[in-house]
Interface confidence: low
């Protein structure tokens, strides 16, 4: 079934909500609103200035960092730009991609992207998990997965971005630096913005237990972002979930795993990299829709419209987005353990339900959603599943 445009207010709302790392079923609704989760199995993030609740939250935070407006690949404005796919391969975005400022002038509901553009991104497996953004906030990862982004001294009062499953994204003040030490990979229905359930607000230097590079994008579930226990989160896309190895024995064990596990992506990846898993060989490319999340601070313009390439898996992505002074990260990137990492890398489940994450310079991260098996995914992070065409 061809991708359908997201023109309804409901859809727009869903886009805003986003899913946490753990991505809940498309029909799932979050009880609590929250920003979209960032990693799919397992990472969550907190919107700028907000608390990371899980992988989904983290993702949502990333979304917040990149901007609160949504851009669809098919929207006019960024013709010819190429974005990097989550897989690390540069993807050509439809020339119809609209600039952030243009998007702002439009309805929050982005138009559907022509199917012709779906080829631009790598195929993604049909979302196995269903996520439904809560009416309040976007989720991070279903399941995308559930990432634990919280630190040892999490701030429960901080903004919650749901991860892995459902949630709505609540606009939050953008911050130049987002400290993502640990994702909650699960996306939560309650708070769409609980990305990884980061205990502390972005920029805080809380101690986060380092987990074994477990952070998936759940997506899957985004328990760590919103389950985020799936996904994200992810629900954990960080090399180590814990900055301090002396927090708890449990945490130490996690740290050991994280150390053994390796890269930030691994650990902070949302627990439920919802929709993130790559399609196997021979898998048909599902139709897709694009949803871009421009950085708030660059919503006014899209200079150059050039794509900020992410490091390929396994490659350090820190300096790619770091600013000269080392304190700011380019749109689409967040600070993790002192370095700038792309949200696509940190939150594998950033885009739920098989959506492909892309980074466009000055615009930030956006998701290319897919339509497959009579299931249509929409939303800023493809967190919404629609089966009724």
């Amino acid at each position: 079934v061809p991708a359908r445009e997201a023109g309804s207010a409901v859809e727009a709302e869903e886009l805003v909500k986003g899913s946490p790392a753990w991505e809940p079923p498309a029909n799932d609704t979050r009880e609590e609103a929250g920003p979209p989760a960032a990693g799919e199995d397992e990472a969550s993030w907190t919107a700028p200035g907000g608390e990371l609740a899980g992988p989904e939250e983290v993702l949502q935070e990333s979304a917040a960092v990149t901007g609160t407006a949504w851009l669809e690949a098919d929207s006019p404005g960024l013709g010819g730009v190429t974005a990097e796919a989550g897989s690390g391969d540069a993807q050509a975005l439809p020339a119809t991609l609209q600039a952030p400022h243009e998007v702002l002038g439009q309805s929050i509901m982005p138009p559907a992207i022509p199917e012709a553009t779906e080829a631009s991104g790598p195929p993604s497996p049909t979302p196995g998990d269903k996520l439904s953004p809560a009416s309040e906030l976007p989720k991070e990862s279903p399941l995308e997965v559930w990432l634990n982004l919280g630190g040892s001294t999490p701030d429960p009062q901080g903004p919650e971005l749901t991860y892995p499953f459902q949630g709505t994204l609540e606009p939050q003040p953008a911050s130049d630096i987002i400290d993502i030490d640990y994702f909650e990979g699960l996306d939560g229905e309650g708070r769409g913005a609980d990305l990884g359930s980061f205990p502390g607000s972005p920029g805080t230097s809380e101690n986060h237990p380092d987990t074994e590079g477990e952070t998936p994008s759940w997506s899957l579930l985004d328990l760590y972002d919103d389950f985020t226990p799936f996904d994200e989160s992810d629900f954990y896309p960080t090399t180590s979930f814990y900055d301090d190895l002396d927090e708890e024995e449990e945490e130490e064990e996690d740290d050991k795993d994280a150390v053994g596990g390796g890269d930030l992506e691994d650990e902070n990846e949302l627990l439920v990299p919802t929709g993130k898993p790559g399609l196997g060989p021979g898998t048909g490319q599902p139709t897709s829709r694009w949803h871009a999340v421009p950085p708030q601070h660059t919503l006014g313009s899209v200079p150059g419209s050039s794509i900020a390439l992410r490091p390929r898996p396994g490659e350090p992505g820190r300096d790619l987005a770091s600013s000269e002074n080392g304190t700011e990260c380019r749109s689409g990137f967040v600070r993790h353990n002192g370095s700038c990492r792309s949200v696509c890398d940190l939150f594998p489940s950033y885009c739920h339900n098989g959506g492909q994450c892309y980074l466009v310079e000055n615009i930030g991260a956006f998701c290319r959603c897919n339509t497959q098996d009579y299931i249509w995914h929409k939303g800023m992070r493809c967190e919404s599943i629609i089966t009724d065409f």
Partner: antibody, heavy 118, light 113 residues
Framework: EVQLLESGGGLVQPGGSLRLSCAAS????????MSWVRQAPGKGLEWVSA????????YYADSVKGRFTISRDNSKNTLYLQMNSLRAEDTAVYYC???????????WGQGTLVTVSS | DIVMTQSPDSLAVSLGERATINCKSS????????????LAWYQQKPGQPPKLLIY???TRESGVPDRFSGSGSGTDFTLTISSLQAEDVAVYYC?????????FGQGTKVEIK
């Protein structure tokens, strides 16, 4: 040492309610997503619900959505599962599990049995 | 939902012999961005809660004996017990942690022949 201790299970009639609790210790509770997984007698495992570390995000299996509510009190290091409109098919041992960032469950409680029967 | 199918349902292996359990997912659980397979394996002994053995398809959880190993990618995975010990008698479950809802395989019962 990480410990998870569930409580609150018991016998309840169809349509009734129960609130399960899971007391956690040995790790920074608020930094981890937590989940509930159940296992019907003689059956396999079924993920029920999950919640992000901050509690801002929650997730549910379709089978319990709208009936169960997961929550947590990080100040008490406790995870909860409010179960309403219980059905016979909800009969199972309910486990709370610490959820890793990759969504795997690295620590499980011993479980609490919930029996829904008239 | 991603459906996880394990085979065989039960397996009888002699002590010291190799035991192999297969798990197939209805969708790929490989996340291309980090090349990680979101698949975990658990061991559940009678009367006990499950125990995480492997995550990311092949990473052993801390404290798990090295006779347990996981392999596979995409949709096909395998848990191998290189030399079955008496204490390994249990039911083993695979679980995809990539997307919501998180789903488990139906379980494979491993016994001693």
């Amino acid at each position: 040492e990480v410990q998870l201790l569930e409580s609150g299970g018991g016998l309840v009639q169809p349509g009734g309610s129960l609130r399960l609790s899971c007391a956690a210790s040995g790790f920074t509770f608020s930094s981890y997503a937590m989940s509930w997984v159940r296992q019907a007698p003689g059956k396999g495992l079924e993920w029920v619900s999950a919640i992000s570390g901050s509690g801002g995000s929650t997730y549910y299996a379709d089978s319990v959505k709208g009936r169960f509510t997961i929550s947590r009190d990080n100040s008490k290091n406790t995870l909860y599962l409010q179960m309403n409109s219980l059905r016979a098919e909800d009969t199972a041992v309910y486990y709370c599990a610490k959820t890793k960032p990759n969504n795997a469950f690295d620590y499980w409680g011993q479980g609490t049995l919930v029996t829904v029967s008239s | 939902d991603i459906v996880m199918t394990q085979s065989p349902d039960s397996l009888a292996v002699s002590l010291g012999e190799r035991a192999t359990i297969n798990c197939k997912s209805s969708q790929s659980v490989l996340y291309s961005s980090n090349n990680k397979n979101y698949l975990a394996w658990y061991q559940q002994k009678p009367g006990q809660p499950p125990k995480l053995l492997i995550y990311w398809a092949s990473t052993r959880e801390s404290g798990v004996p090295d006779r347990f190993s996981g392999s596979g990618s995409g949709t096909d995975f395998t848990l191998t017990i290189s030399s079955l010990q008496a204490e390994d008698v249990a039911v083993y479950y695979c679980q995809q942690t990539a997307t919501q809802p998180l789903t488990f395989g139906q379980g494979t019962k491993v016994e001693i022949k």
